[in-house]
């Protein structure tokens, strides 16, 4: 019962993870330009991955779209790249770990299956979260250095006497509904890690061999450390899992120095 | 079609407050931004604040203190209320409608105020 | 506040003739964002309210006729009226659209012959 929902819950976190990390992928709101400190102005700018958009106080709001391909920043290249990979490798998890819930018959598939999709999605999920927090993070660090390369020059001299306004970018909305999404979306295959350990019961493949000492009775049952309890006639095929060190180590390192803006 | 509309009192003694409607049709409140500005005789334009359509306020940094600008959009009505008024105050006040680019598209006739005893 | 200055304070023009108007801003009124100048231009002729002409420093508003160009970015800026005609006797404001307060020109009052 617990295994069950252990295995639900983390599909259950799961899901709302990656539906958190598409949204964030989609919004506009990556960066927003920075209030504080700086002249009011009646036009607010934004920017998300795919286009930039300007709201005017008036009401309008325009928007524009990166069209360019190979003009882009290589960070903001890599973000996406990163974020669509978690949505993949997020949706793909979903699929398996649907067909891997207890509480889902599908034919006579075999708790061994279920327990190794389970475990497969649930790596999926960790690798997604991970894709996510770590695009976010990288978008995160290009803002703060662009922002204190704005602030160091925020007004730039324009022939004497003129002055001209250099736009600040701070963190967005986009940026915490990815570091949440991708958190649940991590600890939501977690979940189905641990859920995986204890779906499948028990395997012992070793058939009861009974030696006859002369004079006595007594039946010796070889089992290793993973014999039968007791020394009843239990003949049945207990399966095993071996719920042991499986590791995933992704390093993934990111140049801290960007231009974009 | 857009229209703006001024109604004001005419004459105001020094001291007291100016309150204005502007009554708008054609487009909503909620949407769009109204201006205020005002023109003293024979001289140029004077940007006074606007209300905008969530409700957020601008003022002009030398009336901050003595003018207040609230709407209805309900009743599609925009007031604007300055306090102690002086002779300085005495001009034609208009209210118009943001556009694109902020600039004023629409604008009323104007409501002509005079700071008098 | 940002000052809008503009020249001439007033000029005399024949009609058919072009007239330039000039508009300097204190501070640059371009946004980074979309790379568009929140200019506007606003024409008030004797005992009207002020019509709007131009906006974003270029672009025209719907039913002004042609004859009507703004250009310029950053802080200096004109209105160029080309073939001017009798109905064009008025006085033209610049406003800066981008700080608040929203700040207008002295005017360029023009006057036909």
């Known amino acids: 019962m617990a295994v069950t929902a252990c295995q639900g819950l983390g599909f259950v976190v799961s899901l709302i993870g990656i539906a958190g990390i598409i949204a964030a992928t989609c919004m506009d709101q990556w960066s927003t330009q920075d209030l504080y400190n700086n002249p009011v102005t009646a036009v607010f700018n934004y920017q998300g991955l795919w286009r930039s958009c300007v709201r005017e106080s008036s009401g309008f709001t325009e928007c524009r779209g990166y069209f360019t391909l190979l003009g882009l920043p290589a960070m903001l290249q890599a973000v996406r790249a990163l974020m669509i990979v978690g949505i993949v490798l997020g949706a793909i998890g979903l699929l398996v770990s649907i067909f891997a819930l207890k509480c889902i018959r599908i034919g006579s598939m075999e708790d061994s299956a279920k327990a190794n999709m389970t475990l497969t999605s649930g790596i999926m999920f960790i690798v997604s979260g991970l894709c996510a927090i770590a695009g976010v993070s990288v978008f995160a660090n290009m803002l703060v250095t662009n922002f204190w390369m704005s602030t160091a020059n925020m007004y730039t001299g324009m022939g004497g006497m003129v002055q001209t306004v250099q736009t600040r970018y701070t963190f967005g909305a986009a940026l915490f509904v990815g570091w949440v999404a991708g958190g649940l979306t991590l600890i939501g295959g977690v979940m189905m890690c641990i859920a995986c350990r204890g779906l499948a019961p028990e395997e012992t493949n070793y058939k009861a061999v009974s030696y006859h000492a002369s004079g006595h009775s007594v039946a010796y049952k070889p089992g290793g450390f993973k014999a039968s309890t007791g020394f009843g006639s239990n003949t049945k095929n207990k399966k095993i899992y071996d719920g042991g060190a499986r590791t995933e180590d992704e390093v993934q390192s990111y140049p801290s120095k960007h231009d974009y803006v | 079609q857009v229209q703006l509309k001024e109604s004001g009192p005419g004459l105001v003694a020094p001291s007291q407050s100016l309150s204005i409607t502007c009554t708008v049709s054609g487009f909503s409140l909620t949407k769009f931004g109204v201006n205020w500005v005002r023109q003293p005789p024979g001289k140029g334009l004077e940007w006074l604040g606007a209300i905008w359509g969530d409700g957020s306020t601008n003022y002009h940094s030398a009336l901050i203190s003595r003018l207040s600008i609230n709407k209805d959009n309900s009743k599609s009505q925009v007031f604007l209320k300055l306090s102690s008024l002086q002779n300085v105050d005495t001009a034609t006040y208009y209210c118009?409608?943001?556009?694109?680019?902020?600039?004023?598209?629409?604008w009323g006739h104007g409501t002509s105020v005079t700071v008098s005893s | 506040d940002i000052v809008m200055t503009q020249s001439p304070s007033s000029l005399t023009v024949t009609t058919g003739e072009k007239v330039t108007l000039n508009c300097k801003s204190s501070q640059s009124l371009l946004n980074s964002g979309n790379l568009k100048n929140y200019l506007t231009w606003y024409q008030q002729r004797p005992g009207q309210p002020p019509k709007l002409l131009i906006y974003w420093a270029s672009t025209r508003e719907s039913g002004v006729p042609y004859r009507f160009t703004g250009s310029g970015s950053g802080t200096d800026f004109t209105l160029t009226i080309s073939n001017v005609q009798a109905e064009d006797l008025a006085i033209y404001y610049c406003q800066n659209d981008y700080f608040f307060p929203f700040t207008f020109g002295s005017g360029t009052k023009l006057e036909i012959k």
């Open positions: 118009a409608k943001s556009g694109y680019g902020n600039a004023m598209d629409y």
